[in-house]
């Protein structure tokens, strides 16, 4: 089951119409928020959650501050989440850092990682 923070993030990003991810704009059969949220790939949701956490952890995103925060970002939450977080950071840490340092939005970073793909079946 998806955690409430996933839904909160998805809602926040859906409201940000100007910078929304192209795949968020694709409405589901009912065209409702829940369907759209569920259509997001799990990796994309993970990415949004981590990038937003990192943003909150640093006053100003620099190579130094973000790389320091990146070592701590996966330390909170349930162990299953920590494993997902660590696996994601192992794969994308450098690139996420670069995006944050350059002032990219969470959506831009996660889209650029080609994670903005609707899932093929139920999560």
């Amino acid at each position: 089951r998806l955690s409430p923070e996933y839904y909160d993030l998805a809602r926040a990003h859906l409201r940000d119409e100007e910078k929304s991810c192209p795949c968020l704009a694709q409405e589901g059969p009912q065209g409702d928020l829940l369907t759209k949220t569920q259509e997001l790939g799990a990796d994309y949701r993970t990415c949004l959650t981590i990038v937003q956490k990192l943003k909150k952890m640093v006053d100003k995103p620099t190579q130094r501050s973000v790389s320091n925060a990146a070592t701590r970002v996966c330390r909170t939450g349930r162990s299953a989440w920590r494993d997902v977080c660590r696996n994601f950071m192992r794969a994308y840490q450098s690139r996420v850092t670069q995006g944050l340092v350059a002032g990219e939005t969470a959506q831009q970073i996660c889209e650029d990682l080609r994670l903005c793909i609707p899932s093929t079946g139920p999560l």
Epitope: S65, T97, A102
Partner: antibody, heavy 123, light 111 residues
């Protein structure tokens, strides 16, 4: 080929403002941040700040923040720097330089520079 | 701010010899096993030109006689063999901390 074409020399009175431009061509404007660097006559290089044309994010060197405004126009692929409340200390050459948002776009440094705009402040 | 100290401030080298320029940072500029230190060459009346990025990567189109090394706080730019066109001022620059900073520059002259 990549080109950063800067506007012509500026003469200004103390207290006035100047706005310089940097027209980018030969690459995808939104895949690079645009940095600005100051060089006083016979002196070294000083980093002013950068703008991300993709997100509009700006990062300023605290030393320049109060009197400097960086903007960018995606449609014309042009970056701008405005300096206000000019003093003789602002007399310098101002360079724009691109920097990739992600390291796989190119060398992760300021790899192309404009020719510079000379600003002279005198009464 | 991360302070970059270049040495020497100037040096004179004979054609064909080695020029070594040092850059010391007030704190480490490393993360993820990478060093966020770059080297530029500037000739009078011209903009700086990227030579080396992330400590040791040679920029495309730059002759192989230029090389960079170092990590953490100590970095070196080597030019060997020095050619006439290498007479210029060389700057190191870090992009690890905010604000980005440049070294004071090293002026290379030919004997």
């Amino acid at each position: 080929q990549v080109k950063l074409q800067q506007s012509g020399a500026e003469q200004a009175r103390p207290g006035a403002s100047v706005k310089m431009s940097c027209k980018a061509s030969g690459y995808t404007f939104t895949k690079y941040t645009m940095h600005w660097v100051k060089q006083r006559p016979g002196q070294g290089l000083e980093w002013i700040g950068f703008i991300n044309p993709n997100s509009g994010y700006t990062d300023y060197n605290q030393k320049f923040k109060a009197r400097t405004t960086l903007t960018a126009d995606k449609s014309s692929t042009t970056a701008y720097i405005q300096l206000s409340s000019l003093t003789s200390e602002d007399s310098a050459v101002y360079y724009c330089a691109r920097y990739p948002i992600y390291s796989d776009y190119g060398p992760y440094a300021m790899d192309y520079w404009g020719q510079g705009t000379t600003v002279t402040v005198s009464s | 701010d991360i302070e970059l100290t270049q040495s020497p401030a100037s040096l004179a080298v004979s054609l064909g010899q080695r020029a070594t320029i040092s850059c010391r940072a007030s704190e480490s500029v490393d993360s993820y096993g990478d060093s966020f230190m770059h080297w530029y060459q500037q000739k009078p009346g011209q903009p700086p030109k990227l030579l080396i990025y992330r400590a040791s990567n040679l920029e495309s189109g730059i002759p192989a006689r230029f090389s960079g090394s170092g990590s953490g706080t100590d970095f070196t730019l080597n030019i060997h063999p020095v050619e006439e066109e290498d007479a210029a001022t060389y700057y190191c620059q870090q992009s690890h901390g905010d604000p980005y900073t440049f070294g004071g520059g090293t002026k290379l002259e030919l004997k």
